[in-house]
């Protein structure tokens, strides 16, 4: 199956790479603008220059284009704990990330929040913290994993998933209670 091309892609595909069809005259192929610039005016005729202008501060284009406006620079989201890794330039958007010893949790394709890497207290590091994944912890005996932290089995209620891991401790607690009732 041939993928469906949008009108703009159809028009561009008639011209050689790096050029686009003049919107008013489909017999003219104009040279695309370099990254860091945008289209101010189409080329007046074959072999003539496209009028490209540099993006203004706060905007960018990251690839060759024939956009009428540069794209607005992204802002890092403070409320999500994001920090600026590199600032926006005319040919590259802002790069946002997390602080040291934090990882990114993606709530959706283009939205992430920074969280502290788990330290695996009362456990051992099974897999180290990575850019997009928290530390994977293995808990010591007498502890179970809850929200990626090792919690004492004394906090394990019978209805929770921890009961299998903490079964001996729960039975001990139950046994102590039983012996106290006689």
């Amino acid at each position: 199956l041939v993928p469906h091309l949008g009108d703009r892609e159809k028009r561009d595909s008639v011209c050689p790479q790096g050029k686009y069809i003049h919107p008013q005259n489909n017999s003219i192929c104009c040279t695309k603008c370099h990254k860091g610039t945008y289209l101010y005016n189409d080329c007046p005729g074959p072999g003539q220059d496209t009028d490209c202008r540099e993006c203004e501060s706060g905007s960018f284009t990251a690839s060759e284009n024939h956009l009428r406006h540069c794209l607005s620079c992204s802002k890092c989201r403070k409320e999500m704990g994001q920090v600026e890794i590199s600032s926006c330039t005319v040919d590259r958007d802002t790069v946002c990330g997390c602080r040291k010893n934090q990882y990114r949790h993606y709530w959706s394709e283009n939205l992430f929040q920074c969280f502290n890497c788990s330290l695996c207290l009362n456990g051992t590091v099974h897999l180290s913290c990575q850019e997009k994944q928290n530390t994977v912890c293995t808990c010591h005996a007498g502890f179970f994993l809850r929200e990626n932290e090792c919690v004492s089995c004394s906090n394990c209620k019978k209805s929770l998933e921890c009961t299998k891991l903490c079964l001996p401790q729960i039975e001990n607690v139950k046994g102590t209670e039983d012996s106290g009732t006689t």
Epitope: E79, M80, W107
Partner: nanobody, 119 residues
Framework: EVQLLESGGGLVQPGGSLRLSCAAS????????MVWVRQAPGKGLEWVSH????????YYADSVKGRFTISRDNSKNTLYLQMNSLRAEDTAVYYC????????????WGQGTLVTVSS
């Protein structure tokens, strides 16, 4: 005790509007970023929008951008979601929540409010 109470849902025709509210109590509302998430029938949770404590910074999922507006009134401890140009695919239970600290889960939820978009 933290409490979040959503209201304003209902049945609306495609293209119609609704305004959801979320009344918050039990924590310092103005200090917390707040989130609207939704769950369509048989689907997982979708992050719809969020707003920071002061109301200056907002975020919208691509699916609702230009149609939904999040806002808050810190004097009333209330979060809002104005939903315009509603579509059938907006049908879901809508929940408000605090922006998750310290890990990627929600500590408190409301009971949700059902929005049904149908002709």
């Amino acid at each position: 005790e933290v409490q979040l109470l959503e209201s304003g849902g209902g049945l609306v025709q495609p293209g119609g509007s609704l305004r959801l509210s979320c009344a918050a109590s039990g924590f310092t509302f103005a200090h917390e970023a707040m989130v609207w998430v939704r769950q369509a029938p048989g689907k997982g949770l979708e992050w719809v929008s969020h707003i920071d404590g002061g109301g200056e910074s907002t975020y919208y999922a691509d699916s609702v951008k230009g149609r939904f507006t999040i806002s808050r009134d810190n004097s009333k401890n209330t979060l809002y979601l104005q939903m315009n140009s509603l579509r059938a695919e907006d049908t879901a239970v809508y929940y408000c929540a605090r922006l998750p600290p310290p890990g990627p889960w929600f500590d408190y939820w409301g009971q949700g409010t059902l929005v049904t978009v149908s002709s």
